[in-house]
């Protein structure tokens, strides 16, 4: 039928919650083009009626909720004046219990997420919730092994829990909890995230200056390997962190099993008043996923991106 | 839909305290921050903190945080702020506002603005 | 606490010219969700304030198109595409990245 096929990485979820996924990738969906979706490689469309509980929803597939035999390859063709692009995403449905909800503790959690708290700074976490416009989202409410959060160092803004002064006994795990409304219905969403605590980011005395890169896109094409230089300078006796990180993770963790994407040894130059560092991202092979994600050098408190992004189709 | 409306103008003098009110309807009061924002003669906008119906929650610019008061009546979704202590410098208008949504920040929602004169 | 700096102070504009107002801010909006928490405002003579842009380059609701936002982590651009008798007023950048939230001090509009 003429489509490239692109296969994304499996999506873990938790069953008896909402879960919505997005069929967009830029630049293939920023001109005028049509999403479908599918299950299974079936000719049948998902559904578009908002009552289902399974429909798509411009372009994302919308669950309301999630349910045990919806596990899956589920494929969304983005057809566009002269392209044909099949998107195939794997959707892995299981049941996790976080707190044992027999005595009353929180439902069983979604996605497991990592993220870490700066020891001794003021940092936040951050509730992940991606679901297209139709859904009303809120009020987010935070706990920590089990027990909703209160106190004057924590405080909820939108999406995020900012956390004043944090220590070494804000590790643990962590949930986020919002409900979604949609069609006058409510479901419940529960994110866990484990969060640890690095002392590694150090101020120093100094803020580092990051010279390369500068939050832009490079154009890079499907399937090539790419190295990102990150270039930092910084005061001779700093003891900053310079790291590549990815949705607040670092790449070698976020990237563990597949080694994909690879951060590089770190290198310096030293000048008279001050040092050079270099250190690289590779992506060994650039996939689909890679594209629109901003990969965040972080050097102290100075942080800098790229996103990666398709060519512009050359019609010469 | 949503609305914020805000008491009267009200003139004091040095050294006393006032209490403005913030009444709010068209949504759920106890899920939303209510955010108080002053405005001096022919100036830029300054946060003053933050209350949170549910639970009571204060955040506070360091700036106020041993003047400044702020509570609610669920009864009546009102929120009320109370600025001690008065001085020239505070003559300003006051406005409550409301974020976008719960998980879109900025202040989409404004009172309509209440007018503290401090004069002796 | 976060510093956010205007330029220029005033500006005065052709009807259905562009026109563009810059913001600078002590420390990177950008956070590590990938979400900017960076804000525009205009507040017309006599009124409060009204959202413009939300996270950067969002339109708040009921935002006529010919506004813009864009910018990096420190440094943003609010773009008039053609301006109207209507625009005038003074405009405001704003932070909520961290507390206490911050205000530029405020850009005026004026139609020449």
């Known amino acids: 039928d003429g489509c490239k096929d692109i296969f994304m990485k499996n999506e873990i979820l938790s069953a008896s919650q909402p879960f919505a996924f997005n069929c967009t990738f830029p630049p293939i969906t920023s001109g005028e083009v049509s999403v479908t979706w599918y299950k299974n490689s079936s000719k049948i469309p998902v559904s578009k009626i908002i009552q289902s509980r399974i429909h798509q929803d411009e372009t994302w597939i919308l669950f309301l909720p999630m349910e045990w035999g919806d596990s899956g390859v589920y494929q969304c063709v983005i057809k566009g004046r002269d392209s044909c692009h099949r998107i195939h995403v794997n959707l892995t449905v299981f049941e996790k219990h976080w707190c044992d909800t027999s005595i009353g503790g929180l439902p069983n959690l979604s996605d497991e997420y990592k993220q870490i708290l700066h020891l001794g700074k003021d940092d936040s976490l951050t509730c992940h919730l991606h679901f297209p416009k139709s859904c009303v989202l809120g009020p987010i409410k935070w706990y920590k092994d089990c027990n909703e959060i209160k106190g004057e160092r924590f405080t909820v803004l939108e999406t995020r829990l900012l956390v004043s002064n944090v220590s070494a006994e804000d590790r643990g795990n962590y949930a986020c909890q919002a409900i979604l409304t949609h069609s006058g219905k409510q479901y419940e969403v529960l994110n866990g995230i484990t969060v640890s605590i690095t002392e590694r980011a150090g101020y120093g005395g100094s803020v580092p200056k990051i010279i390369y890169p500068k939050n832009h896109s490079i154009e890079v094409q499907l399937g090539t390997t790419l190295i990102v230089d990150c270039n930092v300078t910084d005061t001779k006796d700093n003891t900053n962190l310079r790291c590549w990180r990815v949705n607040n993770t670092l790449v070698d963790d976020y990237y563990d099993e597949s080694k994909r994407i690879r951060e590089g040894v770190e290198t310096h130059v030293s000048f008279r008043e001050h040092n050079l560092y270099t250190v690289n991202i590779t992506f060994l092979e650039v996939k689909m996923e890679d594209y629109g994600l901003p990969f965040m050098c972080h050097a102290g408190v100075s942080t800098a991106y790229i996103i990666l992004q398709l060519p512009a189709p050359d019609f010469r | 839909q949503v609305q914020l409306v805000q008491s009267g103008a009200e003139v004091k003098k040095p050294g006393a305290s006032v209490k403005v009110s913030c009444k709010a309807s068209?949504?759920?009061?106890?899920?939303?921050?209510m955010n108080w924002v002053r405005q001096a003669p022919r100036q830029g906008l300054e946060w003053m903190g933050m209350?949170?119906?549910?639970?009571?929650?204060?955040r506070l610019n360091q700036k106020f945080k041993d003047r400044v008061t702020m509570t609610r009546d669920t009864s009546t979704s009102t929120v009320y702020m109370e600025l001690s202590s008065l001085r020239s410098e505070d003559t300003a208008v006051y406005y409550c506002?409301?974020?976008?949504?719960?998980?879109?920040?900025?202040?989409?929602?404004w009172g309509q603005g209440t007018l503290v004169t401090v004069s002796s | 606490d976060i510093v956010m700096t205007q330029t220029p102070l005033s500006l005065s504009v052709t009807p259905g010219q562009p026109a563009s107002i810059s913001c600078r801010s002590s420390?990177?909006?950008?956070?590590?969700?990938?979400?900017?928490?960076f804000y525009w405002y205009l507040q017309k003579p006599g009124q409060p304030p009204q959202l413009l842009i939300y996270?950067?380059?969002n339109l708040a609701s009921g935002v006529p198109d010919r506004f813009s936002g864009s910018g990096s982590g420190t440094d943003f651009t609010l773009k008039i595409s053609r301006v109207e008798a209507e625009d005038v007023g003074v405009y405001y950048c704003?932070?909520?990245?961290?507390?206490?939230?911050?205000f530029g001090g405020g850009t005026k509009v004026e139609i020449k």
């Open positions: 506002a409301r974020t976008t949504s719960m998980i879109i920040g900025g202040f989409a929602y």
């Open positions: 068209g949504y759920t009061f106890t899920n939303y921050y």
């Open positions: 209350f949170h119906p549910y639970g009571d929650v204060t």
């Open positions: 420390k990177s909006l950008l956070h590590r969700n990938a979400i900017t928490y």
């Open positions: 996270q950067m380059s």
């Open positions: 704003a932070q909520n990245l961290e507390l206490p939230l911050t």
